[in-house]
């Protein structure tokens, strides 16, 4: 294959983007490399330039079309190649057949907003971005709430086992600042993984009502 240990990992966002990371121990940082995508049943092909993200890894996004266009289906197979320049020619470093709908990672949910907030609860909604209509309702979500004095890693995960783009957070403390994040995952796919977490939504619960005698 290639000298040193190499890894080539790609994910499809279900619409018009394949994001790839290629890593190789001992590779030169200034090496010029590309990813080429050749679908088995499409007339187009696409290339992106791998750019360094760390000492021994490179990443790029194959932009297949307009963000919401459905460029691939469940029956497509895309041959992905990593090519690196050696002098005047390109050398193939890796070849992978990639089934897009077995390797899904959606975009992070967007448009988070507070629908209604009270002293002890808060209703939040969001939208999914650039997600294929093929999923219909076959999506799940994870959410987490950052409480004062805690880290995101400590926040318990709330699982929504259906396509539900809202949540009602309960047992909150009055007059307290919180942050909320959500991520999404399709139910299908051998290597399908969670989307990145959404941008955090900050909100504050309402203060407790003052007693009549105070």
């Amino acid at each position: 294959a290639v000298n040193g240990t190499s890894q080539f990992t790609c994910f499809y966002n279900s619409r018009a983007n394949i994001s790839c990371v290629w890593s190789q121990d001992g590779a030169l940082q200034d090496t010029s490399c590309q990813v080429h995508a050749w679908p088995d049943r499409r007339r187009w092909n696409q290339t992106c330039e791998l750019l360094p993200v760390s000492q021994a890894s490179w990443a790029c996004n194959l932009i297949l079309g307009a963000p919401d266009s459905q460029k691939l289906t469940t029956v497509d197979i895309v041959t992905l190649r990593v090519l690196c320049r050696e002098g005047v020619r390109w050398r193939v470093m890796a070849i992978q057949d990639f089934k897009p709908f077995e390797n899904l990672r959606l975009m992070a949910p967007i448009s988070l907003q507070v629908v209604h907030v009270e002293t002890h609860r808060c209703n939040i909604s969001w939208e999914i971005s650039q997600a294929s209509h093929y999923f219909e309702r076959h999506l799940e979500f994870e959410a987490r709430t950052l409480s004062p004095g805690h880290t995101w890693e400590e926040a318990p995960l709330l699982t929504l086992k259906q396509k539900q783009e809202w949540i009602c957070l309960e047992t909150l403390t009055p007059d307290t600042q919180y942050e909320f994040q959500v991520r999404v995952k399709p139910l299908q796919g051998e290597f399908t993984t969670w989307s990145p977490w959404s941008q955090p939504l900050a909100f504050r619960t309402k203060p407790a009502a003052l007693g009549k005698d105070t």
Epitope: S6, E102, E190
Partner: nanobody, 127 residues
Framework: QVQLVESGGGLVQAGDSLRLSCATS????????LGWFRQAPGKKREFVAA????????MYAVSTEGRFTCSRDNDKNTVYLLMNSLKPKDTAVYYC????????????????????WGQGTQVTVSS
């Protein structure tokens, strides 16, 4: 007893195609990553292709130049290797192999990663 049985080899002309099959028995097929290796006379065994348990990713040796396609049919407990535009340098004994450990399909596995091997099928490409 676990068995991998290759078939489909033979003598072909340069430029022809050939499809190798590897039928398995005695194992839970969908729990195994599967691969193809080849060994030419006087040379060491060489990686050709490997596919993950569900077939979502398949890695190919650079030497295949995109001429080979590895696929699996989890209903028929069979893995295939379609070889197009064959060249004399493709002449070798082709082996099917199964890997019990998890394979992500993102790197080139070594022959030592595979636990179960078939007996091989001879492919000869004449010029």
């Amino acid at each position: 007893q676990v068995q991998l049985v290759e078939s489909g080899g033979g003598l072909v002309q340069a430029g022809d195609s050939l499809r190798l099959s590897c039928a398995t028995s005695g194992l839970t097929f969908s729990s195994y990553a599967l691969g193809w290796f080849r060994q030419a006379p006087g040379k060491k065994r060489e990686f050709v292709a490997a596919t993950t348990r569900g077939g979502g990713r398949t890695m190919y040796a650079v030497s295949t130049e995109g001429r080979f396609t590895c696929s699996r049919d989890n209903d028929k407990n069979t893995v295939y290797l379609l070889m197009n535009s064959l060249k004399p340098k493709d002449t070798a004994v082709y082996y099917c192999a199964a890997m019990t450990s998890y394979y992500s399909g993102t790197y080139y596995p070594d022959s030592s990663d595979f636990d179960i091997w078939g007996q091989g099928t001879q492919v000869t490409v004449s010029s």
